[in-house]
Structure formats: structure tokens, C-alpha cells
């Protein structure tokens, strides 16, 4: 969480951002909030990116003002106009690119004053893993697959019964480049599994951490997976 305060002239206002990550090819949100102001016509929201000459986005007098927008963001940005009234200046970024990573500034002007805060935006690819029993294998084998990751992640297996055990000797992980030549499909196979145990396949890079769990018993198979973005720090 980054909290910024205004500078010079008018009073300062508090602006708060949250570091976040974008999944390339999908839409992302750059979070920014400010002290709401009743005089809506005076609210100006500017998004800037370090190293980029033009603006990322500008909202003023109740509408988008995109004449100064940088070419790389053309047609890809929007603020949530109905949320500006409650002090939400978050930016929606469509079709996130790897090159969108960097330091952004959310700069706000209201009738009460000015303020800004920076935001670190990471980009990459992350997806939920799915763990299945591989019935084609000669021994009891689990297969963990996740369709899109970048940068290349690490994959670690764990088990509820054998806590702390190192499964690197009985697992094999491969990374297959996807058709767009950036992201990769992750496939990890775990051998010699036992029934009545819960296994977890953990995939992690510097952007996200995802876990796929599978519990295999005589009568059923239960699966669960979750994904967590790392470094979501507010500022």
C-alpha cells in the first residue's frame, strides 16, 4: 500500500495505491483511491507511467480526456466513472502486455487539493493448476498442469502424510512454450503416490503462487486449487 500526499499550492489530499500484477493477454486493474470530493466537476485523474512521454489516461470534467494519451495505451484504458464519486480512481487496462510493467503514478486534483502516489505494476502470466490421476502411467502417478505461466516458475510437490519430504527425485517437470512464444505450459508428474493422502502441486514465480491439491481415496478423488498474487503492497 502506498499513501501519497499532495504538494504545494492548495491543501494536500491523500492518495492510496496498491502494487499489483497483470496477467498478459487479459484485463488488469491499477488500484488508486483518494479522498472523495463533493465538487465533482473539479476532479482530475491522471495516470502516468515512468519512462513514457504521453499520459496513460486522463479523466477531467466528468469524462475521459485522451488527447495527450500515449500511443501504447490507445484504446486500452478506462476509469470507472460511477466510482469516481466515492474516491475510486482505479484504472482498467485492457489486454495487458509484458511491456506494461513498470512504475505508474496516480495523480489527483480535487477542489480540496492535490495528491499522488506511485504503484509498481508487474506483468506476467499465471494460471490455476489442475491435478489429475494419470491412469496411463505404469505406477500410481499424478499429473499437474497449468496452461500459462511467465516468467518460468518453480514447481514443488508436497504431501499431507509425508510433510517436509522432498519429492524432486520422484517428480518430473517440463515447460512447453505456448504458440504466442512468451508464456509456457507447465506440466509436472509425480510418481509412486499412495492412496489416502493429499498431494499439493505448488507453482510459483515472482508474480503469483498457485496450488493444486488432490486427495485420492479408495472411493473418491477430491480436488481444490487456489491462486494468490504476490507483492500486493499498498502505497
Amino acid at each position: 500500500l502506498i499513501i501519497g500526499f499532495g504538494i504545494s499550492g492548495r491543501h494536500s489530499i491523500t492518495v492510496t495505491t496498491v502494487a499489483s500484477a497483470g496477467n498478459i493477454g487479459e484485463d488488469g486493474i491499477l488500484s488508486c483511491t483518494f479522498e472523495p470530493d463533493i465538487k465533482l466537476s473539479d476532479i482530475v485523474i491522471q495516470w502516468l507511467k515512468e519512462g513514457v512521454l504521453g499520459l496513460v489516461h486522463e479523466f477531467k470534467e466528468g469524462k475521459d480526456e485522451l488527447s495527450e494519451q500515449d500511443e501504447m495505451f490507445r484504446g486500452r484504458t478506462a476509469v470507472f466513472a460511477d466510482q469516481v464519486i466515492v474516491g475510486n480512481a482505479s484504472l482498467r487496462l485492457k489486454n495487458v502486455q509484458l511491456t506494461d510493467a513498470g512504475t505508474y503514478k496516480c495523480y489527483i486534483i480535487t477542489s480540496k487539493g492535490k495528491g499522488n502516489a506511485n504503484l509498481e505494476y508487474k506483468t506476467g502470466a499465471f494460471s490455476m493448476p489442475e491435478v489429475n490421476v494419470d491412469y496411463n502411467a505404469s505406477s500410481e502417478t499424478l499429473r499437474c498442469e497449468a496452461p500459462r505461466w511467465f516468467p518460468q516458475p518453480t514447481v514443488v510437490w508436497a504431501s499431507q502424510v509425508d510433510q517436509g519430504a522432498n519429492f524432486s527425485e520422484v517428480s518430473n517437470t517440463s515447460f512447453e512454450l505456448n504458440s504466442e512464444n512468451v508464456t509456457m505450459k507447465v506440466v509436472s508428474v509425480l510418481y509412486n503416490v499412495t492412496i489416502n493422502n493429499t498431494y499439493s502441486c505448488m507453482i510459483e514465480n515472482d508474480i503469483a503462487k498457485a496450488t493444486g491439491d488432490i486427495k485420492v481415496t479408495e472411493s473418491e478423488i477430491k480436488r481444490r486449487s487456489h491462486l494468490q498474487l504476490l507483492n500486493s503492497k499498498a502505497s
Epitope: 479522498e35 472523495p36 463533493i38 465533482l40 466537476s41 466528468g62 460511477d82 464519486i85 466515492v86
Partner: antibody, heavy 116, light 107 residues
Framework: QVQVVQSGAEVKKPGSSVKVSCKAS????????ISWVRQAPGQGLEWMGG????????NYAQKFQGRVTIIADKSTRTAYMELSSLRSEDTAVYYC?????????WGQGILVTVSS | EIVMTQSPATLSVSPGERATLSCRAS??????LAWYQQKPGQAPRLLIY???TRATGIPARFSGSGSGTEFTLTISSLQSEDFAVYYC?????????FGPGTKVDIK
């Protein structure tokens, strides 16, 4: 000096509609949101919805969705709130106010009585 | 929607005494909270916004504090004209919601 002036009291039959108006002086219209808040006899305040003329946005409380319409006429600096399918529980004082997100100037209120 | 609750429902205070009114939100509203005063037969009047900023023309005896989910309105020394109903209102999220009110009456 900002002034918010509302239309007069109304008596309506159940099932009918009521349309009340609110005229704001100064630059209120182009620069601020206009909201409608009602208060049933002896009860608290209830935000019904609001309009942001400069953003071209209206927002209504879920409870009134489909029954309430708020519009604004920038040329006359007047906002209107229409509530349809009236029932006895809609008997209340209806206030027009400048804002949100919070409300700094209020009209005098209009008593709308729904009775057969 | 965010539900606002206020306590106590009624507060009996003698003139000159201090009155402390509480408001609680069902989830964090940061500092996006306003307080209003309403006297019988009158429209509400804005006292405080931003949890602690006094509105124009509001006497210094009124002060607001708190953030997140817990808020307080304090009237340091009650005057006869302060006996009224007080409402809190959140504006963190649509729809804007009010508390049920606290009636401050003469002890």
C-alpha cells in the same frame, strides 16, 4: 448562496406515480451530483438514488430499482424524481440534496402521502 | 450494501455536558463518513465529512473521529440548540447508507 427549492406536497392513490422537482441555484447543477433521500414518518433517512449530470450517470438504491427514475435538466437547473407503483409505505418526506458523496445542501422536503 | 448502526438510540444529556455518539459500519469505509443533525420538521444539516472535517459554519464544539468501521461524534458542551437527532452516513460504496440515528434529548 446555494439554495435548493423543491415542489409542493402531493397526495397520491396507491398504484399511481408521483413526480417531484428540485431546483438548485448557483453552479450546483453542472458541478455536483443531486440525490434524493426520503424519510418516512418517525423514521430515519434513506438514500434513494442520485444523478451526476456532468458524468451522465444515475445510480439507484436496489430497493427502488425499476420504480424510481431521476433525471436532470441542465438548462433549467432542475432535477426530477419519479416514483411509480406507489404504496402506502411510500408515504414520506422526500428531500432533494446537493451531493453525494455526502450532502451539504438540502431542500425543504416534499411530503408525499399515498392513501386511497 | 454497507449497513450502518448507531448507539445509543437515545442519549439523555444535560446542557453544558459532553455527548459522545457512536457509529459502526458493517465493513471498512475508510474515512468516507459524514454526520448530520436533524431537528423536528427540518431538513438534515451536514456537520462533518471525511470522518473529522467540520462543514462550513459548524461550531468547533462538534468534532468527529475514527476510521475503518468505528466512528465517534463528540459534542464537547451541549447547547440548547444541539438537542436533535444525529445520523451518520457512509460514502465508501454505492448505495450511500445512513445509520438509524441517535436522538440527543435533555436530561
Amino acid at each position: 448562496q446555494v439554495q435548493v427549492v423543491q415542489s409542493g406536497a402531493e397526495v397520491k392513490k396507491p398504484g399511481s406515480s408521483v413526480k417531484v422537482s428540485c431546483k438548485a441555484s448557483g453552479d450546483t447543477f453542472s458541478n455536483y451530483a443531486i440525490s434524493w433521500v426520503r424519510q418516512a414518518p418517525g423514521q430515519g433517512l434513506e438514500w434513494m438514488g442520485g444523478i451526476i449530470p456532468i458524468f451522465g450517470i444515475t445510480n439507484y438504491a436496489q430497493k427502488f430499482q425499476g420504480r424510481v427514475t431521476i433525471i436532470a435538466d441542465k438548462s433549467t437547473r432542475t432535477a426530477y424524481m419519479e416514483l411509480s407503483s406507489l404504496r402506502s409505505e411510500d408515504t414520506a418526506v422526500y428531500y432533494c440534496s446537493r451531493g453525494g458523496p455526502y450532502f451539504d445542501y438540502w431542500g425543504q422536503g416534499i411530503l408525499v402521502t399515498v392513501s386511497s | 450494501e454497507i449497513v450502518m448502526t448507531q448507539s445509543p438510540a437515545t442519549l439523555s444529556v444535560s446542557p453544558g455536558e459532553r455527548a459522545t455518539l457512536s457509529c459502526r459500519a458493517s465493513q471498512s469505509v475508510s474515512s468516507n463518513l459524514a454526520w448530520y443533525q436533524q431537528k423536528p420538521g427540518q431538513a438534515p444539516r451536514l456537520l462533518i465529512y471525511g470522518a473529522s472535517t467540520r462543514a462550513t459554519g459548524i461550531p468547533a464544539r462538534f468534532s468527529g473521529s475514527g476510521s475503518g468501521t468505528e466512528f465517534t461524534l463528540t459534542i464537547s458542551s451541549l447547547q440548547s440548540e444541539d438537542f436533535a437527532v444525529y445520523y451518520c452516513q457512509q460514502y465508501k460504496k454505492w448505495p450511500f447508507t445512513f445509520g438509524p440515528g441517535t436522538k440527543v434529548d435533555i436530561k
